[in-house]
């Protein structure tokens, strides 16, 4: 499906990839002041020796001297499950049982920034993306990845740590935004909404789609997480969104199927391993990227965020059990882990393809006001 | 395609079974709803069941009274409806339903009249 | 739970814009779908989740939900667009469809 505002719900169906340019082209409504913009936080932890909460529970790598590479998952923060989107959720939540910022949730008390002062920064994500004012950057190469088709074994855990659904990854994926842009896959999550309402974090000239997966990347410039965090480039993460197609998701189905065995909050298993770049769209050359942070406490800057423009496409059977299957903290499903966007503050979002460009007939003369800021060279 | 039966002229405080055979799509795959319109009027939720027919909604109008459920070997999708009351006279259509909450495939529906 | 709104009949000359719209309390946190439908006829869904066309409906349908309107844009209005509109979306209850109460166009 294309991304912007997209006239046509004619999914691509089979694969794991959606149509072609969802991200493009096509005039989509804006919805800045809408309720589905209050901030709904992000949700995402980052670990390290310092209980460092961020995209998910990031794994601390440790020097390859140390363990040849192997990344290992502490799970710091979880952020627990999400409020009434219509209140104003970028907060965190203190648990009793945990310290600083090891718990978190969407919805309540206290505001994030005064736990994680970053979450206040102004350079945060998720945001909006308008395709017609992003950056055509011809520098912006086909992402590279390299490794991502894993063998069953060893397994790979799968948990649900209450404010998502979370695959560690092993040691050895590869991932090359450009010449010398390396990163090490460490982990993958997802964020949905419920069924009759979106949940990316991302959106697309104020469109929001069913759910978003993300694959976080460690630059090979670092060893730990914890030193790569507000750094720029330090991290990197890919994002996809997903939406709802004819046919069942394969590659999807493996890691869904087991949902039921992690339905409450904590829980993990083990699943054999799968080909990752399977789960993200198969056109690497076209995606919009930008500078932003982790989607939860700390909030941390300087991420690379990479948002394809093309979608996958899961059943309605698929997203109803991503979206109704698993549990957070106390009684409450685990749905709508989505944080709101946040202003760009002045950022330009570049992007691989002239994306300005609507194919629509019903378009006026392209608009392409920002100009490139040739990353990558 | 989805096609209803079992509509007909039934007498207050009666019952009466709707069947909804499903085909060209994988039946099991889908949650179905059930949406009636009065004559003249608009169209309103009456109930809906998730694929395996675990899961069942009801509007309040009907609870109590109603009974969704399905069948997947059959590709079929039922409403039992007792205690039938004038008001529930209506056209029942029974609609594929999507993720996002809307129905891209709805039966001609069939007509229930509930007199003395 | 949520309720819908829409006018009870819009007037367009042929040719000219229709614009139907359907408000309700935080409509943007829900997908909000518009349904066709002509006497004697079952419902047709012709904008899905705020703004696609399925395939099969023609281009000058369109959608868009922002604040607490969603709105559904005939351009070109043709005498075959002449039917009754439905906005639909789900309600705070989960599982639990809402239909607004119909606008003739």
């Known amino acids: 499906q294309r991304l912007p505002r997209m006239q046509e719900d004619s999914p691509l169906g089979g694969g794991s990839s959606g149509e072609d340019d969802p991200l493009g082209e096509e005039d989509l409504p804006s919805e800045e002041d809408s309720p589905r913009e209050e901030d709904p936080p992000g949700e995402e932890d980052l670990p390290g020796e310092e209980d460092l909460p961020g995209e998910e529970d990031l794994p601390e790598v440790k020097p390859k001297s140390e363990e040849e590479g192997s990344l290992k998952l502490e799970d710091l923060p979880t952020v627990e499950a999400p409020g009434d989107p219509q209140e104003p959720q970028n907060n965190a939540h203190r648990d009793k049982e945990g310290d600083d910022q090891s718990h978190w949730r969407y919805g309540g008390d206290p505001p994030w920034p005064r736990v994680s002062p970053a979450c206040a920064g102004r350079f945060q994500s998720p945001v909006d993306i308008r395709p017609q004012l992003a950056a055509f950057c011809p520098a912006l190469r086909p992402l590279e990845l390299l490794g991502f088709q894993l063998p069953p074994l060893p397994e790979l855990r799968l948990r649900n740590n209450g404010h998502s659904v979370q695959l560690t990854l092993p040691p050895g994926l590869e991932m090359a935004l450009g010449p010398g842009r390396e990163y090490r896959a460490l982990q993958l999550h997802l964020h949905w909404g419920a069924a009759g309402r979106p949940g990316s974090e991302h959106t697309v000239e104020g469109h929001r789609f069913p759910a978003e997966i993300h694959v976080v990347h460690l630059s090979t410039a670092f060893a730990r997480v914890d030193e790569a965090l507000g750094r720029p480039g330090g991290l990197a993460v890919l994002a996809a969104f997903l939406e709802e197609g004819p046919e069942e998701n394969s590659a999807y189905e493996q890691l869904l199927s087991r949902l039921e065995e992690i339905a409450e909050e904590g829980s993990e298993t083990q699943v054999p391993g799968l080909d990752i770049s399977a789960l993200l769209p198969s056109d690497f050359s076209r995606y919009f990227q930008y500078e932003g942070s982790l989607t939860t406490p700390p909030c941390a800057q300087g991420v690379i965020w990479t948002v394809f423009n093309q979608t996958v496409m899961l059943s309605a059977k698929q997203l109803h059990t991503l979206s109704d299957t698993l549990w957070g903290p106390g009684d409450s499903r685990l749905q709508l882990n989505f944080r709101a966007t946040q202003p760009l503050n002045g950022r330009v979002i570049e992007a691989s393809f002239p994306a300005g460009v609507d194919s629509s007939p019903r378009a006026a003369e392209p608009v392409q006001l920002n100009s490139c800021l040739a990353a990558g060279d | 395609e989805l096609v209803e039966s079992g509509g007909g002229l039934v007498q207050p405080g009666g019952s009466l079974r709707l069947s909804c055979a499903a085909s060209?799509?994988?039946?099991?795959?889908?949650?179905i709803n059930w949406v009636r319109q009065a004559p003249g009027k608009g169209l309103e939720y009456v109930s809906n069941?998730?694929?395996?027919?675990?899961?069942?909604y009801y509007a309040d109008s009907v609870k109590g009274r109603f009974t969704i459920s399905r069948d997947n070997s059959k590709n079929t999708l039922y409403l039992q409806m007792n205690s039938l009351r004038a008001e529930d006279t209506a056209v029942y259509y029974c609609?594929?339903?999507?993720?996002?909450?809307?129905?891209?495939?709805w039966g001609q529906g069939t007509l229930v009249t509930v007199s003395s | 739970d949520i309720e819908l709104t829409q006018p009870p009949s819009v007037s367009v000359a042929p040719g000219q814009t229709a614009r139907i719209s359907c408000s309700g309390d935080?409509?943007?946190?829900?997908?909000v779908h518009w349904y066709q439908q002509k006497p004697g006829q079952a419902p047709v869904l012709v904008i899905s989740?705020?703004?696609k066309r399925p395939s099969g409906i023609p281009e000058r349908f369109s959608g868009s939900n922002s604040g607490n309107t969603a709105t559904l844009t005939i351009s070109g209005t043709q005498a075959e667009d002449e039917a009754d509109y439905y906005c639909?979306?789900?309600?705070?209850?989960?599982?639990?469809?809402?239909f607004g109460g119909g606008t003739k166009l």
């Open positions: 609609a594929r339903f999507k993720y996002s909450g809307g129905s891209d495939s």
């Open positions: 060209g799509f994988t039946f099991s795959d889908y949650s």
């Open positions: 069941i998730s694929y395996s027919g675990s899961s069942t």
């Open positions: 935080n409509l943007p946190d829900f997908y």
């Open positions: 989740e705020d703004n």
């Open positions: 639909s979306t789900y309600g705070y209850t989960y599982s639990y469809s809402v």
